[in-house]
């Protein structure tokens, strides 16, 4: 079900996103409880995807993101990033919510959640150079799969961001 | 600027085993691959595999699988690979190398490995 | 895995001629083509990397091309210092292979 133009304010800010896609939700209670993604995002698990089509630097990326009160992508399950690689071309690469600041191999990502390196999904060859910072989800021919690459935080790139579901 | 030492020459038993190392200076050491290469005469160049210091990653070649192992000591700035069931075919002199991008751009001065009864 | 075949194994040229040395790749590699010199009791010193880029300090007569699976380095105008072995390696793929190798000496 669609729960359209949705203009009330919460908490008294705007909502950025208008127009809502809301499933209802079964809850134990008699009350009704929806859970919406923004109307163009994608929904999986808690959480909305938003997969952008323009291209910009991973800064500009990140700001792009936090406009729309979300965040670039956070990788927590191997689900998680099956459900994204489908929605994503080939032919181009998106940058996610992962960055080393200073060239010392420490990734941080951007909602601090813990760096974990058992639970990485780098293609084979990377992470190649320390001066490129920035975290990429790109699809490599040989072998033939998705998968993380280090790039320039400059070069402009595509962009997967993140967001938890609006519940009403 | 970037160096890398290799430890001296071996000459060691069949069915022995060696631990090559490889000291890293000029550099974040725990920032970038290091590469083992072996070469014989007659043999051209064979990448063994490769070790990212920072977080122990590993990738080798199939062919050197349960022959070379690596390891990394960030503190010591020291890349080693451990040759284990020494065969004449492993006497060779081993290079590590560190790799920026996909190529290896700076070597050791090489280690000889002779393996002889 | 990707083999990757050089060629030729030896090559006799006169100082001031132009040297071309080929590899060919087993699979599609991009760019992904390291050109290395190795001179007897040294390790292989990088001339030039992936991209087909010319490493710092390297001078300009050594050059390549190339893409995909066929690449080719070149020296313009061979001196008698660049007497040597020469070898490509592929880094586009896990192994990294290397070629077998040219010698270069003087006629």
């Known amino acids: 079900q669609k729960y359209s133009q949705l203009l009330e304010k919460k908490t008294t800010k705007e909502l950025v996103h208008t127009t809502l896609e809301c499933v209802k939700k079964n809850m134990p209670v008699e009350e009704t409880a929806w859970s919406c993604c923004p109307k163009n995002w994608k929904s999986f698990s808690s959480n909305c995807y938003f997969i952008s089509t323009e291209s910009a630097s991973w800064q500009d990326s990140e700001k792009d993101c936090a406009r729309m009160e979300a965040h670039l992508l956070v990788i927590n399950t191997q689900e998680e990033q099956d459900f994204i690689f489908q929605n994503l071309q080939e032919e181009s690469a998106y940058f996610v919510g992962l960055s080393d600041p200073e060239g010392q191999r420490h990734w941080q990502w951007v909602d601090q959640t813990p760096y974990n390196e058992s639970s990485t999904f780098w293609h084979p060859r990377e992470p190649s150079d320390p001066n490129e910072r920035c975290v990429v989800l790109n699809f490599r021919k040989s072998p033939k799969r998705w998968g993380w690459n280090d790039v320039n935080c400059l070069g402009p790139q595509r962009s997967v961001c993140e967001m938890m579901k609006i519940h009403l | 600027q970037v160096q890398l030492q290799q430890s001296g020459a071996e000459l060691m038993k069949p069915g022995a085993s060696v631990k090559i190392s490889c000291k890293a200076t000029g550099y974040t050491f725990s920032s970038y691959w290091i590469e083992w290469v072996k070469q014989r005469p007659g043999h051209g160049l064979e990448w063994i595999g490769e070790i990212l210091p920072g977080s122990g990653r590993t990738n080798d070649n199939e062919k050197f699988k349960g022959k070379a192992t690596f390891t990394a000591d960030t503190s010591s700035k020291k890349a080693y690979m451990q040759l284990s069931s020494l065969t004449s075919e492993d006497s060779a002199v081993y290079y590590c190398?560190?790799?920026?991008?996909?190529?290896?751009?700076?070597w050791g001065q090489g280690t000889l490995v002779t393996v002889s009864a | 895995e990707t083999t990757v075949t050089q060629s030729p194994a030896s090559l006799s040229m006169a100082i001031g001629e132009k040297v071309t040395i080929r590899c060919v790749t087993s699979?599609?590699?991009?760019?992904?083509v390291n050109w290395y010199q190795q001179k007897p009791g040294e390790p292989p010193k990088l001339l030039i990397s992936?991209?087909?880029t010319l490493r710092p300090g390297v001078p300009s007569r050594f050059s390549s091309s190339g893409y995909g699976t066929d690449f080719v380095f070149t020296i313009e105008n061979m001196l008698s210092e660049d007497v040597a072995d020469y070898y490509c390696?592929?880094?586009?793929?896990?192994?990294?292979?290397f070629g077998g190798g040219t010698k270069l000496e003087i006629k």
């Open positions: 190398a560190r790799r920026g991008g996909y190529s290896f751009a700076y």
């Open positions: 992936e991209g087909n």
């Open positions: 699979t599609d590699i991009d760019d992904d």
């Open positions: 390696l592929q880094s586009g793929n896990l192994p990294y292979t």
